[in-house]
């Protein structure tokens, strides 16, 4: 791999704590690190066909780290897609022009030198501009393990046109059974998006009890279709504490 420039074109402030190189001393080794992590927060990119996608992983380190890209966890070569792709080492970017549905997938940048390696994954979906089923960012919500009495936040990142309806559900037991007579799991609706619910993508649980351990589901629907992803909450507690009673109003997950 070619070495990128040691300057990060996207990093406007010179806040590096590295010691400056002098004539007589070698620079201190520094494992790779992200220089602009705030520019990497958008992980799900839903892009219409024919458009260009640019993924960036602005980084630094000493010696200069190398940059390489994977698609769906495997080496990504230019001949793996029609039209190839461009890697701009100076700006730590990969550019794919004229995307097509076969470009869908997870793209991982790996930045490494002899002192360490870091990676970041973007999710690309190639979409029709016309209305489509909801798309959820992979890996969200994420599993959580917390202490009794803690607060917990689950997040669900949604891309949807038209406006989606978001529900947060919890799998529960009724009379010792997780499955209802119609073979659907029992669920409790914890939260759903209203007309002006701006925080519908986040579920916050306060002062959790062990009874709140279990599977939580982010269910997103629009008039075309639906998608759902789940995460597990594990609440740890001292062995002698009593288990609180469960109060639920059962519903079925369709």
């Amino acid at each position: 791999d070619a070495l990128p420039s040691s300057e990060d074109d996207d990093d406007d402030d010179d806040s590096s704590s590295e010691e400056k190189e002098t004539d007589n001393t070698k620079p201190n080794p520094v494992a790779p690190y992200w220089t602009s992590p705030e520019k990497m927060e958008k992980k799900l990119h839903a892009v219409p066909a024919a458009k260009t996608v640019k993924f960036k992983c602005p980084s630094s380190g000493t010696p200069n780290p190398t940059l390489r890209w994977l698609k769906n966890g495997k080496e990504f070569k230019p001949d793996h897609r029609i039209g190839g792709y461009k890697v701009r080492y100076a700006t730590w970017s990969i550019i794919m022009d004229s995307v097509v549905p076969s470009d869908k997938g997870n793209y991982t940048c790996i930045v490494e030198n002899e002192y360490g390696s870091i990676n970041h994954t973007y999710q690309l979906d190639v979409v029709e501009r016309s209305p489509h089923r909801p798309i959820l960012q992979a890996g969200l919500p994420a599993n959580k393990t917390v202490a009794l009495g803690s607060n917990v936040e689950f997040m669900c990142k949604v891309y949807s046109d038209p406006q989606p309806h978001i529900q947060w559900l919890k799998h529960i037991e009724v009379n010792g059974s997780k499955i209802g007579p119609d073979n659907l799991p029992y669920v409790q609706i914890l939260k759903h998006s209203g007309i002006n619910s701006s925080d519908a993508e986040v579920l916050t649980l306060f002062n959790v009890t062990e009874a709140q351990s279990g599977e939580y589901v982010c269910k997103v629907s629009n008039y075309i279709g639906e998608a759902n992803q789940s995460a597990w909450l594990t609440v740890t507690r001292p062995a002698l504490e009593e288990r609180p009673a469960v109060m639920t109003s059962p519903l079925y997950l369709e």
Epitope: P48, S98, E128, R129
Partner: antibody, heavy 116, light 109 residues
Framework: QVQLQESGPGLVKPSGTLSLTCAVS?????????WSWVRQPPGKGLEWIGE???????SYNPSLKSRVTISVDKSKNQFSLKLSSVTAADTAVYYC?????????WGQGTLVTVSS | SYVLTQPPSVSVAPGQTARITCGGN??????VHWYQQKPGQAPVLVVY???DRPSGIPERFSGSNSGNTATLTISRVEAGDEADYYC???????????FGGGTKLTVLG
Amino acid sequence: QVQLQESGPGLVKPSGTLSLTCAVSGGSISSNNWWSWVRQPPGKGLEWIGEIYHSGSTSYNPSLKSRVTISVDKSKNQFSLKLSSVTAADTAVYYCARATDWFDAWGQGTLVTVSS
Amino acid sequence: SYVLTQPPSVSVAPGQTARITCGGNNIGSESVHWYQQKPGQAPVLVVYDDSDRPSGIPERFSGSNSGNTATLTISRVEAGDEADYYCQVWDSTSDHRVFGGGTKLTVLG
């Protein structure tokens, strides 16, 4: 090499509907491209109006969306623009163009004047 | 909606280097394209994907894009480069195309 040619009336009355067609030659309208309309009022800058994909999927400039319709006719290898309720402010040179992320082929442009 | 800001005019002497900027919020995360338009003519693409040149465009035209500013650089400017120049992006957030307001390049003398 793809070529684009705009056609339609050069004069439209206020409150009427502006209708233009763009004929595509030297390439298929079913290729992986967006077929766009861009306008330029006299002495001013370029303004993107909207675009269509061969599947019929469209995107429009929010400031014009309520008045714009873009359609595609694959059998004739052409696409069309309709802009309703026009006023003198819609007087401009109207270009059709082929695009991916950028515009790589343009028509020569046609001047449409809105006047009674 | 996304806004691209260009200086209305740039003047440069023949043989010198002209730099035309295009400002936008975190524009470095977008792919920027540049067009040249001469009076009475349709625009012509001179740079795409920040810094690539279409075939037939002289090497004197180059581009860069970082942070909040993209730049079109024309080295060894010639009288024939006098024109209006527009930057353009596809704004991935709004799913709309956006043009800058345009910059008139004047070649002095």
